[in-house]
Interface confidence: low
């Protein structure tokens, strides 16, 4: 309606004696600014005077006169929008209607606001969600329709009279729409909060109690259970009886069903609050609980661990690890089901008790072949001693032991023999699968671990074999000790160091590189003639006649070996020179005569010189002196001289007679 002034403010405001009231208010006048404002208490319109009667709490006029009441009541508004008021303190008799008489230059308006002042502070109001379930977070709200700037208040939450630990969020509203103070508390109730009293307490600034509101919590929760067991420690022996009782300590709403569980699995036909177990067996050991359900869900009791004690069961042995390599470490573990756990163990190796081994584990830091075998154990607890189980086999693997190379032949072995060797060993695990031989040769292995050397060489000194499984073990080399005839027999000249000259002292050595056996004999031979039986052949003064082809022989018990023929060369000056004449020593003049200087020399004569009867050297230097045609005056005695690197030799005189031809004689 355009003829109305427009006001906005809370319809009713609440307060209590001694507090204050703050009235948020806005308005819009029909025209112009506000010129006069009067605040009435319970105004009544007087038709006679056409004015409002009532207590004037506040008055603002053009002349500015203000009644003394104005100190308590304040108009905090302005001339065109704000009409906010404050009454501080507020009294019980301020309850009723407040009338805001507004006048502008041309218009008047009376706006009514309800004020409700109580004698004592009124209680806040707690608001709860429609349903509360355990462990689900809810928000509790405490609302008070009061707020005033001049009168600070606080709202505190209590649970069973004790301040709640959770932090509350307090908010206030002083608006034209609403005036209130609100506290919100986020809270996760547990089943134990069911039926508990929650209080929202109104306090002044000093924490003094003003009023409160209380509610009883209705926390929906699954049944809460307590389990009782006889005997109380839940430790029994096989054949004993056990009773378990399930007690419901709380359920909201009421429970509907009961069941029992063992190790999480429901027990059939057990739907009462008592579980009776008669003559228990060890299989009945486990975790027991009861389960009771209501509309919220199932609730479970704490678990009772029922221990049915029994003597150890037959034990088994676990080996870490088998097969084991010699030198490695091995751990044996004795496994036996028992309750209580075994306190003592007895260990057996190949049926014999291992002294001093009483632990669940046996550790052998360094396994040796003699550790192999069957390991078993016996476990013992307070109820008795278990039986020895089947045991476990420890297989200790190791390289072949004590490997030897054995010569099968009768001794001695001779060069060229066929030799058979075998590779023997003391023990091996795993079994020997192959053999190796050193040195390698083109030899045959007729069977595993046997080596056959056909036509054994003189130089086959040592042979070693290895027996191999996963590893190879080598035997010490064995000496074949092959016997053979002397080898590499040769003649060696010891002296002189240079060439042999006639008359020199000469020594020849008969050498050989090796012989087995070592004991040898020597033989020297020239042209099939035995010369000596020593390793050396000596000439005190060599003569050209000693030259020739020499051999030496060395023999041992196996055989004899000859050297290559060695030529002994003796160097000497020309000797046995003579002049031979052809066709004879008497030649007819005019014919041809040839004189030859014959000699024995080593090296051969390299240079000849011819002499006549006057010892005159002739200008001829070859072996033959040819006279052609021969003249009578050539008659006479001739001799020659031969020269080689060793020296010279001369012939005796040889006479040539040249006679006249018949013609010459005829001419005479």
């Amino acid at each position: 309606d355009s003829s109305k002034w427009v006001f906005e403010h809370p319809e009713t405001l609440y307060a209590w004696e001694g507090a204050c009231v703050w009235i948020p208010c806005t308005y819009r006048a029909l025209d112009g600014d506000l010129e006069s404002f009067i605040l009435f208490h319970n105004p009544e319109y007087n038709k006679n005077t056409s004015k409002f009667d009532g207590t004037r709490l506040y008055e603002s006029t053009k002349d500015g006169k203000v009644p003394s009441e104005q100190k308590r009541v304040q108009f905090l508004g302005d001339k065109n929008k704000n009409c906010t008021l404050s009454i501080h303190p507020v009294h019980l008799n301020d309850s009723g209607q407040l009338g805001l008489r507004m006048e502008s230059k041309t218009e008047k308006w009376m706006e009514r606001i309800h004020l409700n002042v109580s004698e004592r502070p009124f209680p806040p109001h707690i608001q709860l969600p429609p349903e509360i379930q355990e462990s689900q977070e809810v928000t509790l709200t405490c609302l008070l329709n009061f707020s005033c700037y001049g009168y600070p208040i606080q709202l505190q939450w209590l649970l069973e009279g004790v301040p709640m630990r959770q932090a509350a969020v307090t908010s206030t509203s002083l608006t034209i729409k609403s005036v209130f103070t609100r506290s919100e508390l986020k809270f996760s109730p547990q089943w134990s909060h069911h039926g508990k009293i929650v209080t929202c307490q109104l306090q002044d600034a000093d924490g003094k109690f003003l009023s409160n509101d209380t509610v009883q919590l209705n926390v929906k929760h699954t049944p809460k259970l307590e389990i009782k067991v006889t005997p109380s420690d839940a430790i029994v022996r096989e054949g004993d009886s056990v009773t378990m009782t399930c007690e419901v300590s709380s359920s909201n709403p009421e429970y509907t069903t009961v069941s029992w569980l063992k190790d999480g699995t429901s027990l059939k036909k057990q739907n009462t609050f008592t579980l009776n177990l008669r003559e228990v067996t060890k299989d009945q050991s486990g975790k027991y609980c009861c389960q009771v359900s209501n509309d919220v869900g199932p609730g479970r009791s704490e678990e009772v661990f029922l221990q049915v004690q029994y003597a150890p069961e037959p034990s088994t042995v676990q080996i870490l690890h088998s097969p084991a390599v010699e030198g490695s470490q091995v751990e044996f573990l004795c496994m036996s089901l028992a309750n209580p756990l075994p306190t003592n163990y007895t260990w057996y190796h190949n049926g014999k008790e291992m002294q001093g081994r009483t632990e669940e584990k046996v550790h052998i830091p360094k396994i040796l072949p003699w550790h192999a075998g069957t390991y078993s154990c016996v476990a013992e607890n307070i109820l008795g001693t278990g039986q020895r189980g089947p045991g476990a086999e420890l297989d200790v693997q190791y390289p072949p032991k004590k490997v030897t190379t054995v010569i099968q032949n009768p001794m001695p072995i001779r060069e060229g023999d066929t030799v058979t060797l075998s590779c023997n060993y003391n023990s091996s695990n795993p079994s020997v699968t192959r053999y190796e031989w050193k040195p390698h040769g083109a030899w045959e292995e007729p069977s595993l671990g046997v080596l056959k050397i056909q036509n054994v060489g003189w130089d086959n000194t040592t042979i070693a074999c290895a027996a191999c499984n996963s590893w190879c073990s080598w035997a010490s080399p064995v000496a074949l000790n092959v016997q053979y005839a002397p080898r590499d027999v040769r003649v060696r000249k010891i002296k002189p160091l240079s060439e042999i000259h006639s008359g020199n002292s000469v020594s020849l050595q008969c050498d050989f590189s090796s012989s087995h056996p070592k004991e040898v004999q020597f033989f020297w031979e020239k042209n099939g003639r035995l010369l000596g039986k020593e390793s050396q052949l000596n000439f005190d003064s060599i003569s050209p006649e000693d030259a020739g082809s020499y051999s030496c022989w060395v023999n041992n018990s196996i055989g004899q070996t000859a050297s290559k023929a060695w030529t002994l060369e003796v160097l000497y000056a020309p000797r046995r020179l003579r002049v031979s004449m052809s066709p004879g020593d008497q030649v007819m003049e005019g014919k041809s005569a040839t004189l030859t200087c014959e000699s024995d020399a080593n090296p051969p004569v390299s240079h000849y010189t011819w002499f006549d009867w006057n010892n005159q050297s002739l200008p001829y230097h070859s072996q033959k002196l040819r006279l052609e045609p021969v003249k009578v005056q050539h008659s006479g005695a001739y001799w020659c001289q031969g020269t080689n690197s060793v020296g010279k030799g001369r012939s005796p005189l040889s006479t040539l007679t040249v006679y006249y031809s018949p013609e010459t004689i005829g001419r005479r």
Epitope: Q329, M354, Q355, P365, K366
Partner: antibody, heavy 119, light 106 residues
Framework: KVQLQQSGAGLVKPGASVKLSCKAS????????LHWLMQRSGQGLEWIGW????????KYNEKFKDKATLTADKSSSTVYMELSRLTSEDSAFYFC????????????WGQGTLVTVSA | ENVLTQSPAIMSASLGEKVTMSCRAS?????IFWYQQKSDASPKLWIY???NLAPGVPARFSGSGSGNSYSLTISSMEGEDAATYYC?????????FGSGTKLEIK
Amino acid sequence: KVQLQQSGAGLVKPGASVKLSCKASGYTFTDSILHWLMQRSGQGLEWIGWFYPGSGSIKYNEKFKDKATLTADKSSSTVYMELSRLTSEDSAFYFCARHEDGYDGFAYWGQGTLVTVSA
Amino acid sequence: ENVLTQSPAIMSASLGEKVTMSCRASSSVNYIFWYQQKSDASPKLWIYYTSNLAPGVPARFSGSGSGNSYSLTISSMEGEDAATYYCQQFTSSPFTFGSGTKLEIK
């Protein structure tokens, strides 16, 4: 030839630590267990513990668990024993010894190291 | 731990005399090992696995025993046998030694 060469004698103050060494030669280091033993002057032998270089495993005599720490350096074939928080009670000869392959028993011994703890 | 008790602690013997020393274990053991130690020297393995002589040990030495009771015997004492002899067990950890028997020449 199997040899165990131990470090030289040492004079140490109470509360301090000392690290003894035992260098092995003449055999494959990782093949045998090396033990440490203690012998106080004029007294018997006490086993401290063993170190197995093949696997790095160690076993201590409970009595020496907080006293001795065994380690090894495979590259130099050396086993070490560190003795900590020394007191005069720890003054003794310390030997390293080796299990012989093929039988238990300490077949090879180091020459021993004399440790003297004195302020 | 298994305590080994050696007796006597000290003994003396004439050259050529037979010598026997004993070693008792508080708990039964599989085998006993014997060591010889001379002054200012490292111990030497003397007898292994109760009765086996270590390499280089003279044949006049012998070892025997089982369970808790073991002994070392010298058939004919010689001057070089004067030393301290220790027994030791390898059956259970910790490996323990006896306190030794000191053998002197009379």
